[in-house]
């Protein structure tokens, strides 16, 4: 048994720097406690963007200062990352861990390439 994680290959952030994508995992068992982490991979360096642990059937809660928000429905997590700028363009990986009950399972998606284009500044009006 293994856990597979699916996420879209490409997402374009909105002009306000908001990107949303779905992270779906094929659970080999009936997990009650799940940890979802968004990782950013750039030049083979991996860093954590945000993480949340949730109980199945409950809402996904990120820390107050997190740039992520999300909702869960069954084995699907809808993730939104805000405050993105052009320099944040990169590969965003969804990592899912089934923490409880045993056994533990790890699932890592192939990543979603998020493209962020900074909006053009408004021209000064006379």
């Amino acid at each position: 048994k293994a856990m597979h994680v699916a996420q879209p290959a490409v997402v374009l952030a909105s002009s306000r720097g908001i990107a949303s994508f779905v992270c779906e995992y094929a659970s080999p068992g009936k997990a009650t406690e799940v940890r979802v982490t968004v990782l950013r991979q750039a030049d083979s360096q991996v860093t954590e963007v945000c993480a949340a642990t949730y109980m199945m059937g409950n809402e996904l809660t990120f820390l107050d200062d997190s740039i992520c928000t999300g909702t869960s429905s069954g084995n699907q997590v809808n993730l939104t990352i805000q405050g993105l700028r052009a320099m944040d363009t990169g590969l965003y990986i969804c990592k899912v861990e089934l923490m409880y009950p045993p056994p533990y399972y790890l699932g890592i998606g192939n990543g979603t390439q998020i493209y962020v284009i900074d909006p053009e500044p408004c021209p000064d009006s006379d």
Epitope: R35, L39, E48, K95, Y104, Y105, L106, G107
Partner: antibody, heavy 118, light 108 residues
Framework: QVQLVESGGGVVQPGRSLRLSCAAS????????MHWVRQAPGKGLEWVTF????????YYADSVKGRFTISRDNSKNTLYLQMNSLRAEDTAIYYC???????????WGQGTLVTVSS | EIVLTQSPGTLSLSPGERATLSCRAS???????LAWYQQKPGQAPRLLIY???SRATGIPDRFSGSGSGTDFTLTISRLEPEDFAVYYC?????????FGQGTKVEIK
């Protein structure tokens, strides 16, 4: 830089207890799951136990279940292994290891030797 | 529990030669959650390869991993004197985390 330093090993009689510590530095300890792995003299690596980010979830190898307890203090950046009812077959070098972002054990301590002998 | 079996137990080669190490799993290792570690006498293991084929930070490109499912391979294209050590494979996709018994690469 990432550093893991184990301590607490030594010689102990069968049936007695020992507590190992692993002091972590150079990274945000609470953001990583951690493991203990052991290696008997001249043998291979054996996974012992795992602990989640907040210490809420713990998993153990069958060989130590009910005797060993893993814990962590995120405020002290320290991982612990409480070993009770020690047996001769528990004699090994005990390593603490960090789980990397993508799953493998990316950093290991230098190990601490536990010898169970009468 | 996923049991990992490494072969051969010992590999006797000369510097400059190619080393091919095998790791076979008793059941499928999901999404290639397989790692390779190098261990030298008196030292802790060091991560070489993760995800079956991705090199860890600072690992020379003479080390490469391949395989999927139940059969995995670690290849050292040209052995350097510092490569003579014991190599372990490990699966980390589910608990219990398991290691192979190791392959010793020794100087011929």
């Amino acid at each position: 830089q990432v550093q893991l330093v184990e301590s607490g090993g030594g010689v102990v009689q069968p049936g007695r207890s020992l507590r190992l510590s692993c002091a972590a530095s150079g990274f945000t300890f609470s953001s990583y799951t951690m493991h203990w792995v052991r290696q008997a003299p001249g043998k291979g690596l054996e996974w012992v136990t795992f602990i989640s980010y907040d210490g809420h979830n713990k998993y153990y190898a069958d060989s130590v279940k009910g005797r060993f307890t893993i814990s962590r203090d995120n405020s002290k950046n320290t991982l612990y292994l409480q070993m009770n009812s020690l047996r001769a077959e528990d004699t090994a070098i005990y390593y603490c290891a960090r789980t990397g972002w993508l799953g493998p054990f990316d950093y290991w301590g230098q190990g601490t030797l536990v010898t169970v002998s009468s | 529990e996923i049991v990992l079996t490494q072969s051969p137990g010992t590999l006797s080669l000369s510097p400059g030669e190619r080393a091919t190490l095998s790791c076979r799993a008793s059941q499928e290792v999901g999404d290639s959650y397989l790692a390779w570690y190098q261990q030298k006498p008196g030292q802790a293991p060091r991560l070489l390869i993760y995800g079956a084929f991705s090199r860890a930070t600072g690992i020379p490109d003479r080390f490469s991993g391949s395989g999927s499912g139940t059969d995995f391979t670690l290849t050292i294209s040209r052995l350097e004197p510092e490569d003579f050590a014991v190599y372990y494979c490990q699966q980390y996709g589910s608990s219990p985390w398991t290691f192979g018994q190791g392959t010793k690469v020794e100087i011929k």
